[in-house]
């Protein structure tokens, strides 16, 4: 009995390099601590982008990460990654762990392909 | 006998609203006239974006279409669509018809998802 994690397949970063997407899990469990990790997949390698633990009191996460922010509500996390550039285009996976109390559950989404286009520099003002 | 048409699944438009992608067909036939049509699929509807006929002499196409340009070489067409805006994000299909001499062949690619992000306006220069 695993948890199902769903996330959108594609998201476009804004011209400011900000991408937002939801990460949801089901079935919803009465959980005191939920850990959410954002991973980037490049080739066969996974690298951790950011991670946080949400609780009933801590519904705003990723305070230690300048590039990530997120809010938690029931079984949905709204994730935002900022400071993205074209080289950061790639597949970003949302991993959800129901940490406490037991039983421990873990699930991984199929990934959100984030596309980033670098803006053209504005012309110098004379 | 149909021809196989291949095109990339995803392309990002530049910040200037320009998207380029190849459209190739196989098997390669010795053909005097090749007609290439770019179609946009929205829901269950197809709308023609632009079309042109390439010959041995006319290897530059879409001269009648301000938003399309393309070059033809053997069994590959390099397509460029410009003037794209965020609302133009969508699936663009490449249709290839071997017009002459007989036999007539036709094939359609699976489509290229073009993503377009509108650039932020530059601040007014004082």
């Amino acid at each position: 009995e695993a948890i199902q994690v769903t996330q959108p397949s594609v998201v476009l970063a804004s011209s400011h390099g900000v991408a937002s997407f939801p990460c949801e899990y089901s079935p919803s469990h009465n959980t005191d601590e939920v850990r959410v990790t954002v991973l980037r997949q490049t080739n066969d390698q996974m690298t951790e982008v950011c991670a946080t633990t949400f609780t009933e009191k801590n519904t705003v996460g990723f305070l230690d990460y300048p590039f990530c922010s997120g809010t938690f509500n029931e079984s949905r996390v709204n994730l935002t990654i900022q400071g993205l550039r074209a080289v950061d285009t790639g597949l970003y996976l949302c991993k959800v762990e129901l940490m406490y109390p037991p039983p421990y559950f873990v699930g991984m989404g199929n990934g959100t392909q984030i596309y980033v286009i670098d803006p053209e520099p504005c012309p110098d003002s004379d | 006998e149909a021809i196989q048409v291949t095109q990339p699944s995803v392309v990002l438009a530049s910040s200037h609203g320009v998207a380029s992608f190849p459209c190739e067909y196989s098997p390669s036939h010795n053909t005097d006239e090749v007609r290439v049509t770019v179609l946009r699929q929205t829901n269950d509807q197809m709308t023609e974006v632009c079309a042109t006929t390439f010959t041995e002499k006319n290897t530059v196409g879409f001269l009648d279409y301000p938003f399309c340009s393309g070059t033809f070489n053997e069994s590959r067409v390099n397509l460029t669509i410009q003037g794209l805006r965020a609302v133009d994000t969508g699936l663009y299909l490449c249709k290839v018809e071997l017009m002459y001499p007989p036999p007539y062949f036709v094939g359609m690619g699976n489509g290229t998802q073009i993503y377009v992000i509108d650039p932020e306006p530059c601040p007014d220069s004082d």
Partner: antibody
Amino acid sequence: EVQLVESGGGLVQPGGSLRLSCAASGFTFSSSSMHWVRQAPGKGLEWVSGISGSGGSTSYADSVKGRFTISRDNSKNTLYLQMNSLRAEDTAVYYCARYLMSFNLTRTSWFDVWGQGTLVTVSS
Amino acid sequence: DIQMTQSPSSLSASVGDRVTITCQASQAISNYLNWYQQKPGKAPKLLIYDASNLETGVPSRFSGSGSGTDFTFTISSLQPEDIATYYCQQGDAWPWTFGQGTKVEIK
């Protein structure tokens, strides 16, 4: 080698207090949920209390709620059980146990590593 | 809390015998049933998790089966080192609860 070593047990009078410690080594302590399980002389196993890896969430058996407090110091890789208002029925060997959380398994529900135990005797 | 009932509470068997212990849950727990071995004066040791999965390093003479409310633990050929008390534990609903144990002795 993954290891848990309990200490702090002993003889205490009813109504007294005792603090048990469990020193962990050989694994990432801060990401592991840790628990206390006790065994009264000649009896079976009873789960007592648990704490999440971060220390932010705790839970207790009804029999000890309000009297026992579980805590952890992740910088010292140590788990604690503060036992107050002790009763004769709290007499037992107290084991600390790691609750397995593995990304190789989508769901886990068992204690995979146990300490050797420390005996707590409540008697006048 | 879910109640776990083990039987028998004790048994005596000869070396080489097949030994079977049963565990019954007060409500259905799917396959979330674990078995531990506890030798005298020692800590419990996980043998089987999720009803039938053998923990790494545990001899293959130990096995488990069952689902729902009724579970079985088997030692296919009893060895002298298997003298211990065996406990089942449900892992379906928190808090985890244990059976009262089955003491296995050699005749």
